[in-house]
């Protein structure tokens, strides 16, 4: 857990909710070098394991909108454009942090939440289970 | 910007820093159904665009450890195990939220930060630029 601070110059934490509750400055600092990176660009179309992006919207969460990748095929796309079912398109998932409004309707009170999102797809060799 | 709330039952926001500052409960709620999902499992090894995971650690950030994917090859791995340089292994990137301690070393004061992380790799057809 997060320990109780005694640092001078830090915001007061003598709150009954501390150490569970912290102050967060919402002036987001963006560490991305490009101001608007085309992150995964058009990879979703050019990949051998292409995917579609589906919008997941929830106004009680920040970010309110998250895009979920759904692989287009069970198999992977070959150079001739056909699908090779000897290979598998699988989603690459990542656990991300979001802020959930809590109590609901309170615009300045949140709870940290972890959610699992599919970011894109990759083509893998299947695991073959041999029957004895 | 974010406006000053007057909702009863909501945390007080008559702070000189408000509306930039909100309260966040750090008792993380985990929405993932599985308690410990093997997120992208062993896909990093089985993928035709395999990757290695590099640890990015920063004690002034939450989460303090983030795993960054680095594609192993410029090309993609063929069925015979050789690398096909007519295809490209590329990182799938995602913008994620982290909490940055601010002022530094203050355990209960954070700033929201967006960082771009590589989650895994996918195999794409290269964009060929034809010279006239």
């Amino acid at each position: 857990g997060i320990a109780i601070p005694r640092n001078s110059g830090c915001p007061n934490s003598e709150d009954k909710n501390f150490p569970r509750t912290v102050m967060v400055n919402l002036n987001i600092h963006n560490r991305n070098t490009s101001t608007n990176p085309k992150r995964s660009s058009d990879y979703y179309n050019r990949s051998t394991s292409p995917w579609n992006l589906h919008r997941n919207e929830d106004p009680e969460r920040y970010p309110s909108v998250i895009w979920e990748a759904k692989c287009r095929h069970l198999g992977c796309v070959k150079a001739d454009g056909n699908v090779d079912y000897h290979m598998n398109s699988v989603p690459i998932q990542q656990e991300i942090l979001v802020l959930r409004r809590e109590p609901r309707h309170c615009p300045n009170s949140f709870r940290l939440e972890k959610i699992l999102v599919s970011v894109g797809c990759t083509c893998v060799t299947p695991i073959v289970h041999h029957v004895a | 910007g974010i406006a000053i709330p007057r909702n009863s039952g909501c945390p007080n926001s008559e702070d000189k820093n408000f509306p930039r500052t909100v309260m966040v409960n750090l008792n993380i709620h985990n929405r993932n159904t599985s308690t410990n999902p093997k997120r992208s499992s062993d896909y990093y090894n089985r993928s035709t665009s395999p990757w290695n995971l590099h640890r990015n650690e920063d004690p002034e950030r939450y989460p303090s450890v983030i795993w960054e994917a680095k594609c192993r090859h410029l090309g993609c791995v063929k069925a015979d195990g050789n690398v096909d340089y007519h295809m490209n292994s590329v990182p799938i990137q995602q913008e994620i939220l982290v909490l940055r301690r601010e002022p530094r070393h203050c355990p209960n004061s954070f700033r929201l930060e967006k960082i771009l992380v590589s989650v895994g790799c996918t195999c794409v057809t290269p964009i060929v630029h034809h010279v006239a």
Partner: antibody
Framework: EVQLVESGGGLVKPEGSLRLSCAAS?????????MCWVRQAPGKGLEWIAC?????????DYASWARGRFTISRDNSKNTVYLQMNSLRAEDTAVYYC?????????????WGQGTLVTVSS | DIQMTQSPSSLSASVGDRVTITCQAS??????LAWYQQKPGKPPKLLIY???TLASGVPSRFSGSGSGTDFTLTISSLQPEDFATYYC????????????FGGGTKLTVL
């Protein structure tokens, strides 16, 4: 100063086309915002037209009546959002406002331009 | 689409009066409702969001309440600068997002 400035309005004949522009300054188009168009006919109320995500995913929403005739687009390098209007009718005469939705709270419009007047008349 | 019915459509009052404007949604919108003030020749100005949260810089004489389908904007003591047209606005998401506005309430001097 954070502001939105619309341009491109004017007189157009019925069945004609027009492209409106909205230049943003004081902030950059990014994953933090959605850019929208809202219109107001003379002496009438406000009517939402469409919104577009300002981040790196191409995503749009349209009012049911606007889909097909109106197209929202953006150019992040120019920090500008556009509204292409086709097959214009007299009832499309209105002040067209550019408005921003902050991704922190997508339930309302937090910034508005001054508007540009479009008149559809023969 | 969700219909937003605002009433009254026009209202006359005097400085110092307490004024109430209502907005009714055709289906539940939780508390995702905003109120705007608009003066002639100007764009709308945000007053209230999330049904009851006062926007930055807005005087405390303005307040909002309600949830579900019924919402109210109250001006506790009218000031000369408050004579304007007021609009409610909803947010809704099902398969796609939509915003809708009420027809407006024109507040004039009695």
């Amino acid at each position: 100063e954070v502001q939105l400035v619309e341009s491109g309005g004017g007189l157009v004949k019925p069945e004609g086309s027009l492209r409106l522009s909205c230049a943003a300054s004081g902030f950059s188009f990014s994953s933090d915002y959605w850019m929208c168009w809202v219109r107001q006919a003379p002496g009438k109320g406000l009517e939402w037209i469409a919104c577009i995500y300002a981040g790196d995913v191409d995503d749009t929403d349209y009012a049911s009546w606007a889909r097909g005739r109106f197209t929202i687009s953006r150019d992040n390098s120019k920090n500008t959002v556009y509204l292409q209007m086709n097959s214009l009718r007299a009832e499309d005469t209105a002040v067209y406002y550019c408005a921003r939705v902050d991704g922190f709270d997508i339930t309302y419009f937090d910034l508005w331009g001054q508007g540009t007047l479009v008149t559809v008349s023969s | 689409d969700i219909q937003m019915t605002q009433s009254p459509s026009s209202l006359s009052a005097s400085v110092g009066d307490r004024v109430t404007i209502t907005c009714q949604a055709s289906q539940t919108i939780n508390y995702w409702l905003a109120w705007y003030q608009q003066k002639p020749g100007k764009p709308p100005k945000l007053l209230i969001y999330r049904a009851s949260t006062l926007a930055s810089g807005v005087p405390s004489r303005f307040s909002g309440s309600g949830s579900g389908t019924d919402f109210t904007l109250t001006i506790s003591s009218l000031q000369p600068e408050d004579f304007a047209t007021y609009y409610c606005q909803n947010y809704y998401y099902s398969t796609s997002r939509s915003y809708g506005f009420g027809g407006g309430t024109k507040l004039t001097v009695l």
